[in-house]
């Protein structure tokens, strides 16, 4: 399995290197998932012809999956740091029932998985301690997200495969945008 | 790491235009955020503007919005800067750099591959 951000050799190496601020941490962990995130795809991808399909075929999907838009404050035009921060945290909060779902969804990269998982939990808890406005953030029903897993379990073979491929792209997306944003806070 | 060429770059009036390009052989540039940065005899290299992996996803240093737009057309493995209303202090040479996670961001540490830089000279 792949060693979480801060405990590489490298790391164990250079033992007086300055402790990392909490922009680089963050920065530092969202690379760490998306370096996860690069693994997975390329097993989906091994497994099954998904990634050959247009972006515009793959669309047509009924999975709400977080997306930025440009009210949510994280591009250029209208950047807002506080409304953006909102966005990334309650975002990571909606993907977790999907990243629930890839658990059982690999063969050889398993613990990949499970590490994409909780390392996203990680940049949670990271990300709230920086954000002023908590009270802003909603999270998802636990109901609504065990039926949605429930149901997203019972589809057949061939959605199951679209769906972790689309999961695994839009959760790339995501991250990509949010630290762009992140980066310029 | 990507190889990454620059090109386009020239003498031009002020208020004229040019269009750089940069461009790999690099069969997943795709993936790649993609910035452009620029230094002046004398002064330190700053960021111009930068592109995501997502192409609507684009960034602009205060000095050229408006004035400058990235783009990128994968099918050609090739960003472009277009630069129009040069003015004498747009003068530098400007590099390309691209990020493999797909991120960028205006800090020369973001990038992992650097181009040998185009000469851009606006003078009358």
């Known amino acids: 399995a792949p060693v979480p951000p801060g405990e590489d050799s490298k790391d164990v190496a250079a033992p007086h290197r300055q402790p990392l601020t909490s922009s680089e941490r963050i920065d530092k962990q969202i690379r760490y998932i998306l370096d996860g995130i690069s693994a997975l795809r390329k097993e989906t991808c091994n497994k099954s012809n998904m990634c050959e399909s247009s972006k515009e075929a793959l669309a047509e999907n009924n999975l709400n999956l977080p997306k930025m838009a440009e009210k949510d404050g994280c591009f250029q035009s209208g950047f807002n740091e506080e409304t953006c921060l909102v966005k990334i945290i309650t975002g990571l909060l909606e993907f977790e029932v999907y990243l629930e779902y890839l658990q059982n969804r690999f063969e050889s990269s398993e613990e990949q998985a499970r590490a994409v998982q909780m390392s996203t939990k990680v940049l949670i808890q990271f990300l709230q301690k920086k954000a002023k406005n908590l009270d802003a953030i909603t999270t998802p029903d636990p109901t609504t997200n065990a039926s949605l897993l429930t149901k997203l379990q019972a589809q057949n073979q061939w959605l199951q495969d679209m769906t972790t491929h689309l999961i695994l792209r839009s959760f790339k997306e995501f991250l990509q945008s949010s630290l762009r944003a992140l980066r310029q806070m | 790491e990507v190889q990454l060429v620059e090109s386009g770059g020239g003498l031009v009036q002020p208020g004229g235009s040019l269009k750089l390009s940069c461009t790999t052989s690099g069969r997943r540039f795709s993936e790649y955020a993609v910035g452009w940065f620029r230094q002046a005899p004398g002064k330190e290299r700053e960021f111009v503007a930068d592109?995501?992996?997502?192409?609507?996803?684009?960034w602009y240093a205060e000095s050229v919005l408006g004035r400058f737009t990235i783009s990128r057309d994968d099918a050609k493995n090739t960003v472009y800067l277009e630069m129009d209303g040069l003015k004498p202090e747009d003068t530098a040479v400007y590099y390309c750099a691209a990020d493999k996670y797909g991120v960028g961001g205006n800090a020369q540490g973001y990038y992992d591959s650097w181009g040998q830089g185009t000469q851009v000279t606006v003078s009358s």
């Open positions: 592109i995501g992996e997502q192409a609507d996803n684009t």
